[in-house]
């Protein structure tokens, strides 16, 4: 049902979902002082630009009695419930953050007339893709994808001299939500990655991936995983690997192998990791030594939804349009904005582009050493390290296919 | 062990400047939003100023706007004060502090305080 908003006559309000099932178990007090931050810089912007409005936020909490996974598995429901609760309240604002499981986003989109712009921290699955009112500020899985599509077609490169069209996927169902889909993407028969590929298998158990590791007859060297580099240790141990196996390891939201101290352990060396650049993290901040990589930049994308509201509601009302109109709810996308740290670029979609960072790690140093990045936003990799001193031979990438190339 | 270490105060006439200084040490500066209160003789601590981490954002006190800029040098780890048309009531003890946003800095829920630089100015 059409629900009055909160969100005229110089006076803003933003719907907080804050719910019990999230894409990343962050305590929601964190949450509460991204956004408000985020609306200090707000109010300073506007105020600023010579605009006297007021802008609030209010926090819809789930009760949690009845959806209490904590995680994303029951999180369906549970959207639905809060935009009940909202319904009910007659409290929505001029837009709605939140949610950020893949399930509760595309539910709420499927089951409610929007008129109003949904921001996500999260919705990582392709479902949730080409939605008009629905913006994502963590890099969605179609983005992942195009990445691996276009480095396997790569073969100009001096490191990078075959094109590949093989892989295996390893996916066990344990994966946190941000893998979960990434992976679910790449398994997908119907997806861009399962298109542009000859061959793809999807490895569940652990003993599938040990194999293969040193299997003459595999069908591909590449495997593909997700996750850091202690779920790495922890399925492969100190096993042998076969000298033209390829690990591409994806841990976008993982800034750690940036720091200066950082070593690089030798069941990483055959490991290219797929991360985002890193930026200004808090990451070494004492305040959040207790946060996980991902869960810093899960409060970060709040609060750069919250800032991307405020630079939509600055556009609107200088321009003197109505706030709450069809207009305004299409109108989160194909754009840039001053987030947090920097400029925050959104595509023709709503979703957040990004630098992507391949790394590798050099046999003489036991660094982490970047070897291209990958700009999401014109599908684009540029190479930065043309001679890595790689552990495969010739320092190249082999064939994806053994028995061809550098072996 | 973090250390903020201010400098550049002193005794000034009304209407003179100012420009205070804070040198971090023993933290990542750029991951952390930077700010200033002062605190007058016989009066509650005062927030003046924050400024974000990447330097994009600027807050300020009422009392401090238009008059106060502050800036930072995430390459030098140094957090800046320029005080403009100084007025005897900005008389104080200033102190150059540290927090996660500028929300909590604000707020001073869990900041890293500094030593303080005093300013006098005198009518």
């Known amino acids: 049902s059409q629900v009055s908003q909160n969100c005229h006559n110089g006076s803003y309000e933003i719907s907080v979902l804050m719910m019990g099932n999230s894409a990343f178990a962050e305590p929601l007090k964190n949450l509460e002082d991204a956004v408000n931050e985020g609306l200090e810089i707000v109010r300073g912007r506007l105020q600023n630009a010579g605009l006297n409005v007021t802008v609030n936020a209010t926090f819809m909490y789930s009760d949690g009695l009845i959806h209490n996974s904590g995680d994303c598995r029951s999180s369906t429901c549970e959207g639905l419930d809060l935009l009940r609760k909202i319904s009910n309240a007659q409290r929505m604002g001029c837009v709605l953050i939140g949610p950020s499981c893949t399930y509760s986003t595309f539910q709420m989109y499927l089951d409610t007339e929007l008129s109003y712009p949904m921001i996500s921290a999260g919705s990582f699955g392709l479902s949730c893709d080409y939605k008009e009112t629905l913006t994502r500020l963590m890099s969605p899985a179609r983005k992942l994808m195009y990445f691996l599509v276009n480095f396997w077609k790569t073969n100009d490169l001096p490191f990078k001299t075959y094109s590949w069209s093989t892989s295996y996927v390893y996916k066990n169902g344990t994966e946190t939500e941000d893998c979960f889909w990434y992976l679910n993407a790449l398994e997908a028969s119907v997806s861009y990655f399962s298109h542009e590929l000859g061959f793809k298998v999807v490895l569940r158990q652990d003993k599938e991936f040990q194999d293969i590791l040193m299997d003459h007859n595999r069908k591909s060297n590449v495997i593909i995983m997700c996750g850091g580099p202690e779920f790495l240790y922890k399925l492969k141990g100190d096993r042998a690997v076969a000298e033209d196996i390829v690990i591409i390891l994806v841990d976008l939201f993982n800034d750690q192998y940036f720091e200066d101290n950082v070593t690089a352990p030798d069941y990483m060396k055959n490991v290219l990791v797929l991360t985002l650049s890193p930026g200004n993290s808090l990451l070494n901040s004492s305040f959040s030594r207790n946060l996980s990589p991902t869960k810093r930049d899960f409060a970060l994308a709040y609060l750069n939804g919250i800032l991307l509201f405020g630079h939509m509601l600055k556009i609107f009302l200088e321009n003197g349009e109505n706030i709450t109109t069809p207009k305004f709810a299409h109108a989160f996308r194909n754009l840039t904005f001053e987030g947090y740290d920097g400029p925050v670029t959104l595509d023709d979609w709503g979703d957040v582009d990004s630098t992507m960072v391949l790394l590798y790690t050099s046999v003489d140093t036991k660094k982490y050493k970047v070897l291209l990045t990958y700009d999401t936003h014109v599908n684009k990799t540029y190479p930065v390290d043309m001679s890595p001193t790689f552990t495969w031979k010739n320092s190249k990438l082999p064939n994806d296919i053994t028995g061809r190339g550098p072996q | 062990q973090m250390q903020l270490v201010e400098s550049g105060g002193g005794l000034v006439q009304a209407g003179g400047s100012l420009r205070l200084s804070c040198i971090a040490s023993?933290?990542?500066?750029?991951?952390?939003?930077m700010g200033w209160f002062r605190q007058a003789p016989g009066k509650e601590r005062e927030w003046v100023s924050c400024v974000t981490r990447s330097g994009g954002d600027t807050l300020y006190a009422d009392s401090a706007k238009g008059r106060f800029t502050i800036s930072r040098d995430n390459a030098k780890n140094t957090l800046f004060l320029q005080m403009n048309s100084l007025k005897p009531e900005d008389t104080a003890m200033y102190y150059c502090?540290?927090?996660?946003?500028?929300?909590?800095?604000?707020?001073?829920?869990?900041?890293?305080w500094g030593q303080g630089t005093q300013v006098t100015v005198s009518s």
């Open positions: 502090v540290a927090a996660l946003f500028c929300h909590n800095l604000r707020l001073n829920t869990g900041n890293y």
């Open positions: 023993g933290l990542t500066f750029p991951t952390y939003a």
